[in-house]
């Protein structure tokens, strides 16, 4: 729980935030979440590194991996096979994008105690993964898929086209992975492991991204990655699906495309499994207001799989684009063929349908002014999802079970009243047929990690309480958070503000605006943070607010769609408009105003700043985007249709940073970004730059050399040190 | 290790029937393809049948079906081969072997000798 | 069914020799093609499958390529345990079909 504020008397042994606390961690929290292998039972890494396996119904434990055996091979990760008969061990962990990995892999026989040898798997691979059934093994090695029957066979090679940068098997190219499927796989099991389905992509004719490495070298070496821009040509993608036990057969046989799909570039957006022998994909346009979900049967006579067009159904939205930030994807029931799923109801709210034939007869499960976030599972008599709805307050999550067999189904919240002062914000892990389940608390209070009975929701045990950071944090001054709300012009705007310990109404603050502001997304949540920004607050005295405007999620279409195709438009001026509010409170020094933001939230931050209201004092834009030309594909049209003169170009050329370069002039401007940054290229602050010193403005930068856009490292204490400078210097605060 | 072990071989007369055996161990029988190849005397290898891991689907060679069956009890490890209505040219030693992924012989028996003759 | 031929059917060769073997499938078999010792009285034992991989515990010399239609099987440096009867099979459709076998004897 949050330390509630102490008497003057023990004050003096309080001490405020320090930007060293932040950038080593200090209060940084935990949480915990089993890895379920069984209705009852888990496994979890102990503190000394052993994998312990939890069976809560007998209450005990053992070991089932001796932190030795993980030190013998310097692993990092592991995964027991679903049999309990090997163990993968993971080491030599080598990052690529945000999801994907290359790592080594050694194969643990439990029942001798020995490692695989013989038919070792090559390395590194790019990867790896059990059957749901059996130890049957799937894994990506040079964008080709392999298969194992047991660990110590040979594989059995199931594609063969594989090349680097031009055919992806199994695993996505950079703008699926970032875009889409949001994973470093794109191959999936069927129930039993019967079948093994897979995507390839095709980027042989994809314009390349190429940006030099400095590294250590004499020369620098370049970095090349297939990555489509706005407009561009995009992957190929196709998927097939393999009999894993008799792969050569027939080999691998291709899923049909929709034919309403089919008929114009379009995307796979992910793959569901009903059964063994039923397969639910999911295909978008790439227009990507229309989607389809596409159930398909295998055909035994001729071993090839069916995808009639009773078993299509479409998706489409009038007033934005398909979905929130994804389409959402299919939760089947019992039947395998009818299914639950999240999308606009005809007040414009995301909620819980049932589709048993048709879209058009969905039945809605869940109503109202909030959103359903989330479908964790369904068993035989209960739907748990997560929700919005508890108090009316947007940026919070609670869990629900609705009681499907039953009529009429009975709601139940399970998390509303468990800890309503600490925790506001949940999410869930389920264990199979929801016996058991873990919720984790992310706040507003500390996290905290718990145990329930899946049919009483009773509270078994705490699995992680940050015992260590309550105790680190009661000697600590940190600053107040609000979230409240403004009304303006019939748009609710949300707001966190984050308050010095000492905050007084009558004195006036130094405002420092965060803003991310990207379409579907949430900066407004009730949740715990010890960072930058509650330095900023608690030592430094700034007031911090971050808004939810127009494009954000979770409060229904017409706030989320408003900005459908004119990116860079509302979500500034929802940001002005609060700053505005914010000062008509009283306690704003409104000559001591500065916005930042990171990515998305530097674009905002630097048209904030461009916008010649006059509000800001100085901003800072880290990694921002400047013109949506130079961004993925994928993610650009969703909001913005193509750059083409028929469809939205206007807008791509008016919405860009360097069209503002002028509006600069009466700014303090401080632009940052790495330059191996494979998402946010560096190309966006080097137009940035060239626009500003052409325009003869000033303007401070700083470069990270060889950082991607997460500025990791190193690079993050520079940074962090960097801006609080900035900022002290704009607000004139002493060092 | 990977062991197979034959048995049931013999001399029978045309027309006649006879049942071999494979005992397996060393591996997980249940999760493989297994097969029966045979070998005249001085002659090549001739694949005879397979049968699925769980034992439903199952192939044969034309020379073969309608006359053999396979099976397998995958609680006692063992693979079978029923032969009816036997002829003289079906003498060979049959080997039982591991087909990996349908598609490699990767483990052998020691073969049993199936003499057809009267 | 798919016929594979082999040749030639006998060879004679010395210790050091590098020989080769060659098999042709009826058809494209794609990469699904196996080679197999096999030694008088004995059982046969895989060597290389799909087409070029080496089985565990086999030595290096041997070595396989080809994929469609055509491949071969080379023993860089035969070596006096070698002497055997060569096999190349394939399995498309599981329907495995095997060469009618490759004699390698002492010259």
């Known amino acids: 729980l949050r330390p509630s504020r102490v008497h003057n008397s023990e004050e003096n042994t309080m001490r405020a935030l320090t930007l060293k606390d932040i950038l080593n961690g200090t209060f940084s929290y935990k949480t915990f979440f089993p890895n379920w292998i069984s209705g009852q039972e888990y496994l979890h890494q102990s503190a000394d590194n052993n994998i312990v396996l939890y069976n809560i119904e007998t209450g005990q434990s053992y070991t089932i991996l001796s932190n030795r055996t993980m030190k013998s091979v310097n692993a990092s990760n592991y995964g027991l096979s679903p049999d309990r008969q090997f163990v993968y061990l993971e080491s030599d962990y080598s990052k690529l994008w945000r999801y994907s990995y290359t790592a080594t892999y050694y194969i643990y026989d439990l029942s001798n105690g020995e490692f695989v040898r013989g038919n070792e798997l090559p390395r590194p691979i790019q990867y790896l993964c059990w059957s749901p059934v059996g130890s049957k093994l799937a894994y990506v090695y040079q964008n080709n898929i392999y298969l194992k029957q047991r660990p110590g066979d040979p594989p059995f090679q199931i594609t063969f086209n594989g090349r680097e940068n031009k055919i992806f098997n199994g695993i996505p190219d950079w703008v699926y992975e970032e875009e889409m499927l949001a994973t470093k796989y794109a191959l999936w099991w069927s129930p039993n492991g019967k079948f093994l389905a897979y995507a390839e992509f095709n980027d042989t004719d994809i314009p390349v991204i190429a940006y030099s490495y400095y590294g250590d070298e004499q020369y620098p070496r370049t970095i090349n990655i297939p990555y489509p821009k706005a407009g561009a040509k995009n992957p190929v993608v196709r998927i097939f699906i393999i009999d894993t036990t008799y792969p050569a057969y027939v080999g691998p046989q291709e899923v049909p495309v929709p034919a309403m799909i089919a008929s114009s570039d379009y995307y796979f957006s992910w793959l569901t499994w009903v059964t063994d022998e039923r397969v639910c994909l999911q295909w978008l346009k790439r227009v990507q207001n229309v989607s389809v979900l596409s159930i398909c049967d295998f055909r035994e006579d001729w071993q090839t799989w069916d995808c009639p067009k009773t078993q299509e159904h479409i998706e489409e939205s009038r007033t934005g684009w398909a979905g929130g930030f994804f389409v959402s994807t299919p939760v089947f029931s019992y039947d395998a063929i009818s299914y639950y799923k999240i999308f606009s109801d005809k007040d414009g709210y995301k909620h819980i349908h049932y589709i048993k034939d048709t879209v058009e007869n969905a039945i809605q499960i869940t109503s109202g002014k909030w959103e359903a976030i989330n479908i964790f599972r369904v068993t035989q008599d209960s739907l748990f999802y997560s929700s919005n709805e508890f108090e009316e307050y947007p940026g919070r999550r609670n869990i629900y079970r609705i009681s499907i067999g039953s009529y009429p189904p009975s709601k139940k919240c399970v998390t509303c009243h468990l800890r309503k002062e600490r925790c506001q914000y949940y999410t869930a892990s389920f264990s199979d047929y929801a016996k058991y389940y873990a919720l984790v608390c992310y706040g507003p209070g500390i996290p905290i990690s718990t145990l329930h009975d899946g049919r009483t929701d009773q509270e078994i045990k705490i699995l992680e309480e940050n015992k260590e950071l309550e105790n680190a944090l009661k000697n600590i001054q940190l600053p107040k958070e609000e979230i409240k709300k403004l009304e303006v012009d019939e748009i609710t705007l949300w707001y966190k503000m984050i308050l010095p310990p000492q905050f007084d109404r009558s004195k006036k603050y130094p405002l420092l605006i965060q803003v991310y502001g990207g379409p579907c997304s949430q900066s407004v949540r009730s949740v715990f943070a010890v960072n930058w920004i509650s330095y900023l607050a608690s030592k430094e005295g700034m007031v911090i607010a971050l808004v939810d405007g127009r494009g954000t999620a979770f409060q229904g279409d017409k706030l989320l769609y408003a900005v459908y195709r004119k990116l860079g438009v509302y979500e500034v001026e929802d940001q002005i408009t609060a700053v505005r509010k914010f000062i008509e409170m009283g306690f704003i020094d409104e000559k001591r105003i500065a916005i930042w933001g990171w990515s998305y939230g530097g674009y905002v931050s630097s048209l904030a700043l461009a916008s010649g209201t006059g509000l800001f004092k100085c901003g800072i834009a880290v990694a921002p985007v400047s013109s949506w030309e130079y961004y993925a594909s994928v993610y650009t049209e969703r909001f913005m249709g193509l750059p083409t003169k028929d469809d939205n170009l206007e807008h791509y050329k008016n919405s860009t940073v360097m069209a503002r370069a002028e509006y600069f002039r009466n700014v303090d401007y401080l632009l940052i970004h790495g330059t191996a940054d494979d998402n946010v290229h560096f190309q966006n602050s080097a137009q940035i730059a060239k626009a500003l010193v052409n325009a003869q403005v000033d303007f401070q930068a700083m470069w990270y050399s060889d950082q991607n856009h997460g500025l990791s490292g190193l690079s993050t204490n520079h940074l962090y040190t960097h801006m609080t400078h900035f900022l002290k210097q704009c607000f004139s605060l002493s060092d | 290790e990977v062991q197979l072990v034959e048995s049931g071989g013999g001399l029978v007369q045309p027309g006649g029937s006879l049942r071999l055996s494979c005992a397996a161990s060393?591996?997980?029988?249940?999760?493989?393809?297994m097969s029966w190849v045979r070998q005249a005397p001085g002659k090549g290898l001739e694949w005879v049948s397979w049968i699925g891991p769980e034992g439903s689907r199952t192939g044969y060679a034309d020379s073969v079906k309608g006359r053999f069956t396979i099976s397998r009890d995958n609680s006692k490890n063992t693979l079978y081969l029923q032969m009816n209505s036997l002829r003289a040219e079906d003498t060979a030693v049959y080997y039982c072997?591991?087909?990996?992924?349908?598609?490699?012989?990767?483990?052998w028996g020691q073969g049993t000798l199936v003499t057809v003759s009267s | 069914d798919i016929q594979m031929t082999q040749s030639p059917s006998s060879l004679s060769a010395s210790v050091g020799d590098r020989v080769t073997i060659t098999c042709r499938a009826s058809?494209?078999?794609?990469?699904?093609l196996n080679w197999y010792q096999q030694k008088p009285g004995k059982a046969p034992k895989l060597l290389i499958y799909?087409?070029?991989s080496l089985q565990s515990g086999v030595p290096s010399r041997f070595s396989g390529s080809g994929s469609g239609t055509d491949f071969t099987l080379t023993i860089s440096s035969l070596q006096p345990e070698d002497f055997a009867t060569y096999y190349c099979q394939q399995a498309t459709l599981l329907l495995p079909t095997f060469g009618q076998g490759t004699k390698v004897e002492i010259k």
């Open positions: 058809q494209s078999i794609s990469s699904y």
């Open positions: 060393g591996f997980t029988f249940r999760g493989y393809i």
């Open positions: 799909a087409a070029s």
């Open positions: 072997a591991r087909l990996l992924y349908g598609t490699w012989f990767d483990y």
